[in-house]
Amino acid sequence: SITGISPITESLASLSTYNDQSITFALEDESYEIYVEDLKKDKKKDKVLLSYYESQHPSSESGDGVDGKMLMVTLSPTKDFWLQANNKEHSVELHKCEKPLPDQAFFVLHNRSFNCVSFECKTDPGVFIGVKDNHLALIKVDYSENLGSENILFKLSE
């Protein structure tokens, strides 16, 4: 469970894949679409607001923790919209919602090597946000083998 309904801190960052493709968000037909694409050099990267929450669960070795507690994040590219896991469709979607946010909007933050992070579904442990066919998708990861899989690694930059 989340310790409080209030985030402990937030930061604005652009999100890119391990292979330096940008995660972008476009408003189409009154809903937001998420794209994974190579950006032209002069194009400004989209920013995402990461809100960090303390979980009462102790942090694992790979989990990014504060004071021994695991960190969960929500990701919001624009006011009132959040990334959410759709476990049935194995997809990542942007939904407009009000606080308190549903569990599908929370992801366990894992710090990886080379300044990379990964996002594990709160609602489905072992399932991570990843890249599939130039879109974000939910990818099941075998802990013993693939925690370093490039397709679930993301870079955060200001």
Epitope: S6, I8, E10, L12, L49, L71, E158
Partner: antibody, heavy 128, light 108 residues
């Protein structure tokens, strides 16, 4: 355990520049999660936020002090610093450095902060 | 900027009693971005509560925060000898962040 320690001269002459440094130990200033900041407390009075900084160097200042304040960060030394120019007796205070949580306001497109770990404070007197 | 008014200015109570401290904002917050700090003489402030009601790490559960909009409360359910101090509220809903003037909780 994260600890913060302020250092700098305890006495500054009027019209001169106050310079303080905060050294962070037990954790990295390069954290992409938290912010760092300065708060002051004049003798017998309440608390006043001076400003905050992110590891990248992005700064946020109190509008009432903005024209006189510079906050900078040195990630290689795990330190951040405060410079306050043209000081007067009204700047006499205990100066605290702190780690901060930053929260974003979509309407203002600005961050605001609360402080979760504080240094012990250093007294700065402005007097000739 | 948001002005925070704390009341009472001084609260005289005995150990074991319940303390109720008030913090009123000049403008309503859409969020619950309010923090409470404790400060003892000669010491730095210590974070007690953030997000109006979330206890900071290591803070005993006799401290609790509540409220929304313009009215916020810090409650100390049973005062311990070490709780006699000055308490400040602080808003971080919008910049610049601001502090209340403080409430001194003293031994009766």
């Amino acid at each position: 355990e994260l600890q913060l320690q302020e250092s700098g001269p305890g006495l500054v002459k009027p019209s001169e520049t106050l310079s303080l440094t905060c050294t962070v130990s037990g954790g990295s200033i390069r954290s992409s999660i938290f912010y760092w900041g300065w708060i002051r407390q004049p003798p017998g009075k309440g608390l006043e936020w001076i400003g905050s900084i992110y590891y990248s160097g992005r700064t946020y200042y109190n509008p009432s002090l903005k024209s006189r304040v510079t906050i900078s960060v040195d990630t290689s030394k795990n330190q951040f610093s405060l410079m306050l120019t043209s000081v007067t007796a009204a700047d006499t205070a205990v100066y605290y450095c702190a780690r901060a949580g930053g929260l974003y306001n979509w309407n203002d497109e600005s961050f605001s902060f609360y402080m979760d770990v504080w240094g012990q404070g250093t007294t700065v007197t402005v007097s000739s | 900027e948001i002005v925070l008014t704390q009341s009472p200015g001084t609260l005289s109570l005995s150990p074991g009693e319940r303390a109720t401290l008030s913090c009123r904002a000049s403008q309503s917050f859409s969020s619950s971005y309010l923090a409470w700090y404790q400060q003892k003489p000669g010491q730095a402030p210590r974070l007690l509560i953030y997000g109006a009601s979330s206890r900071a790490t290591g803070i005993p559960d006799r401290f609790s925060g509540s409220g929304s909009g313009t009215d916020f409360t810090l409650t100390i359910s049973r005062l311990e000898p070490e709780d006699f101090a000055v308490y400040y509220c602080q808003q971080y809903d919008r910049s610049p962040l601001t502090f209340g003037g403080g409430t001194k909780v003293e031994i009766k």
